[in-house]
């Protein structure tokens, strides 16, 4: 009789554990759903506001010609900055011309003042060549002033109206770039 009661008690305990597990799974699922919903709503809101305003760039991005730029409000190392841009469907800023450089430095002056901002430029450890993240070489007028004597990997950043270089593991703001949406009108 005692054995029977003990068996029933163990079965009940097992059932309780399973229910707790199910509740935990449900809570996790609910949290995940809420998170997905939040991003979905944000995406829809962005899409709708873009469609309504015929805006070629997302909210809080600035436009110049066919590009949209996002100036970060957080610091991170170069590699994390790249990751942050990719999550938004963009890449670290790739400066193609003096005109683009002037626009960026002029905008930064208005927005934030004289801070350091990572761009998508890094120095190859073997050859010492500067390359944009897509593998292309910067034009001669857009090479960083030699400033970093680091033994570590060296990356490019913008400060005031200059392109400079620094150890990629230092913390800086960053600038993301993506293509502006073309108006269908």
């Amino acid at each position: 009789k005692l054995l029977q009661v003990s068996t029933i008690a163990m079965q009940q305990q097992e059932k309780l554990i399973q229910q707790e597990r199910a509740l935990l799974n449900f809570t996790e699922w609910k949290r995940s759903c809420a998170l997905q919903m939040k991003y979905c709503q944000a995406f829809m809101q962005n899409s709708l506001s873009s469609a309504h305003n015929s805006s070629p760039c997302p909210n809080n991005w600035i436009q110049n010609r066919e590009s949209c730029y996002y100036v970060s409000e957080i610091w991170s190392i170069w590699h994390t900055s790249q990751e942050n841009c990719l999550k938004e469907g963009s890449t670290l800023l790739q400066i193609e011309s003096k005109e683009e450089m002037d626009f960026i430095t002029g905008s930064l002056r208005k927005i934030k003042g004289s801070y350091d901002y990572w761009v998508g430029l890094s120095q190859d450890g073997h050859s010492g060549r500067w390359l944009w993240q897509d593998g292309s070489s910067p034009s001669p007028g857009l090479l960083p002033a030699e400033r970093s004597q680091s033994a570590n990997q060296v990356c490019g950043y913008v400060k005031s109206n200059s392109l400079l270089s620094s150890n990629c593991s230092t913390w800086k703001y960053f600038i993301c770039e993506k293509y502006a949406l073309r108006s269908s009108v």
Epitope: Y39, F43, L86, K87, G89, T91, G135, K178, Y179
Partner: nanobody, 115 residues
């Protein structure tokens, strides 16, 4: 959820070539970026190459000029053409997809460069 399926890994001699493919399926309407990371034994996972939804491309310094990432038009699929492979390219290569705060990963495919 998003599922990522990789193919194309294997054993290759130094100087040889391999092509990796990754197909995304599941609840996807738009991925912001797709691409590859790799992890060599005893090392951290590192970005290899990525392509954004609007076609912007990112390569890690060690693979620039040797690897080419491309997107298959009309499909949530990316390929990584790896040329002039070196022993230091030996790693498990993971497909990755990004959509804002969400980060999706494939199971990984082994690439071994050895003579």
């Amino acid at each position: 959820d998003v599922q990522l399926v990789e193919s194309g890994g294997g054993l290759v001699q130094p100087g040889g070539s391999l092509r990796l493919s990754c197909a995304a399926s599941g609840s996807i309407f738009s991925l912001n970026a797709m691409g590859w990371y790799r992890q060599a034994p005893g090392k951290e996972r590192e970005l290899v190459a990525h392509i954004t939804s609007d076609g912007r491309i990112v390569y890690a310094d060690p693979v620039k000029g040797r690897f080419t990432i491309s997107r298959v038009d009309g499909k949530n699929m990316v390929t990584l053409q790896m040329n002039s492979l070196k022993p230091e390219d030996t790693a498990v290569y993971y497909c990755n997809a990004k959509h804002y705060a969400s980060n999706y990963w494939g199971q990984g495919t082994q690439v071994t460069v050895s003579s």
